[in-house]
């Protein structure tokens, strides 16, 4: 079952999977002028059986200059052309990440492929967000999301993660400032207490939470 | 590889505080969150809190006032501090880290410390 | 905090048979983590965000569940699963796991 809508969208972040559910779809896209060749795969799909996943199909570009026209390459599957990119960062699989049952590692770069990838995900997919440069994490849980089924309608996590500009201060409750040092903070400091006013254009992206962030500490 | 160890002292007086090392390889610091949990003998896991990848941290709220987790990027290494030890504070300590970033599901584990709180 | 009970606490089981353990959560959870811990070492990765399994865990495993209550089942269970299996969730503050289901394999 695909996902209805994409990861949500934090402020200054970037969400990559680590390992790809059977089921997504990689659109087959190429860099300005590149396009598919004629009669290549519209999408990478990630197959599988009992032992082994792996991408079906392969994306491959030619340079446009070939032939007289300059079509745009159009998302497939058709009802997911809207779909917005979904893998900002480098395609490069962290080294350390095991092999799960049931998921694809991250597909290798081919020839002339666009700058972003744009997937479509599957019912039960995790995907894990970082703060971009020049950003904090403020963390009032896992900076995850998972898309999942709710009476019959698809619904991603929210990730309880906010990234702030490096000198702003505000902090989600029950959560210290990062360590200056090694040593453990200050006996002396305690967590801040968030007020609404702190938080306005924050709250606003983290309104759909699924725990409330005005509470001095863990309930 | 991914692999963490945990080092502690194993036995500690009553009132005093417990000082845990997690010392971690075969990734960084940096990017993904370290999370401590601990197991009484006999009994089941309690979380006690972790330490993301930006530095900033959160408590089990019932452990709050006298826990302490802090890191040392350069070396790989995480530290637990918790002071004001009481016998029931007896447990296998674990250091852990999610699968992916600072996410939530436990994919690789130390071995555990087992720390005694005895006179 | 969000409290899971599993149940049972001890389950018995001959091997073949189909076995279910659950987890049952006081408030609705997004989605549950499972781990397998056999008796002196580190709790096992086993099944994430509900229904998804770890690296290495035999295919005859599956999770299920949304809400409040969540399940682990092993299609044919065999010795070697004979294990303590504990609930985790973080969809509420403060994480917490269940109690655990001790499998007893007869």
């Known amino acids: 079952e695909l996902c209805d809508d994409d990861p949500p969208e934090i402020p200054h972040a970037t969400f990559k999977a680590m390992a790809y559910k059977e089921g997504t779809m990689l659109n087959c896209e190429c860099k300005r002028g590149f396009r598919r060749i004629k009669s290549g795969s519209l999408y990478m799909l990630c197959t599988g059986n009992s032992s082994h996943s792996s991408w079906d199909n392969q994306c491959q570009c030619t340079s446009s200059a070939t032939r007289n026209t300059t079509k745009q390459v159009t998302p497939q599957p058709e009802e997911q052309k809207e779909r917005k990119t979904t893998e900002m960062q480098s395609p490069m699989q962290p080294v350390d990440q095991a092999s799960l049952p049931g998921h694809c590692r991250e597909p290798p770069p081919w020839e002339n492929e666009a700058t972003e990838r744009i997937y479509h995900f599957v019912v039960g997919q995790m995907v894990y967000y970082q703060c971009v440069q020049g950003y904090r994490a403020l963390h009032r849980g896992p900076a995850e999301s998972v898309c999942k089924m709710t009476h019959g309608k698809t619904r991603w996590t929210q990730p309880q993660l906010i990234c702030t500009g490096e000198m702003e201060t505000s902090q989600f409750p029950g959560e210290e400032k990062p360590q200056a040092s090694p040593e453990g903070r200050p006996e002396s400091e305690t967590s801040c207490l968030v007020t609404t006013t702190d938080f306005q254009i924050q709250t606003e992206m983290a309104a759909t939470m699924e725990t409330s962030i005005f509470t001095t500490e863990y309930q | 590889q991914v692999q963490l160890k945990e080092s502690g002292p194993g036995l500690v007086a009553p009132s005093q505080s417990l000082s845990i090392t997690c010392t971690v390889s075969g990734f960084s610091l940096t990017s993904y969150g370290i999370q401590w949990v601990r197991q009484p003998p006999g009994k089941g896991l309690e979380w006690l809190g972790v330490?993301?990848?930006?530095?900033?941290?959160n408590y089990n709220s019932a452990l709050m006032s006298r826990l302490s987790i802090s890191k040392d990027n350069s070396k790989s290494q995480v530290f637990l501090k918790m002071n004001s030890l009481q016998t029931d504070d007896t447990a296998m300590y674990y250091c852990?880290?999610?699968?992916?970033?600072?996410?939530?599901?436990?994919?690789?584990w130390g071995q555990g410390t087992l720390v005694t709180v005895s006179s | 905090q969000i409290v899971l009970s599993q149940s049972p606490a001890i389950l018995s089981a001959s091997p073949g048979e189909k076995v279910t353990m659950t987890c049952r959560a006081s408030?609705?959870?997004?989605?549950m983590h499972w781990y397998q811990q056999k008796p002196g070492s580190s709790p096992k990765p086993w099944i994430f965000a509900t229904s998804n399994l770890a690296s290495g865990v035999p295919a005859r495993f599956s999770g299920s569940g949304s809400g409040t209550s969540y399940s682990l089942t092993i299609n044919r269970v065999e010795a070697e699963d004979a294990d303590t299996y504990y609930c985790?969730?973080?969809?509420?503050?403060?994480?917490?796991f269940g109690g655990g289901t001790k499998l007893e394999i007869k």
């Open positions: 852990a880290r999610a699968y992916g970033y600072d996410g939530s599901w436990l994919a690789y």
């Open positions: 330490i993301w990848a930006g530095g900033s941290t």
């Open positions: 408030s609705s959870v997004s989605y």
């Open positions: 985790q969730q973080w969809s509420s503050n403060p994480p917490t």
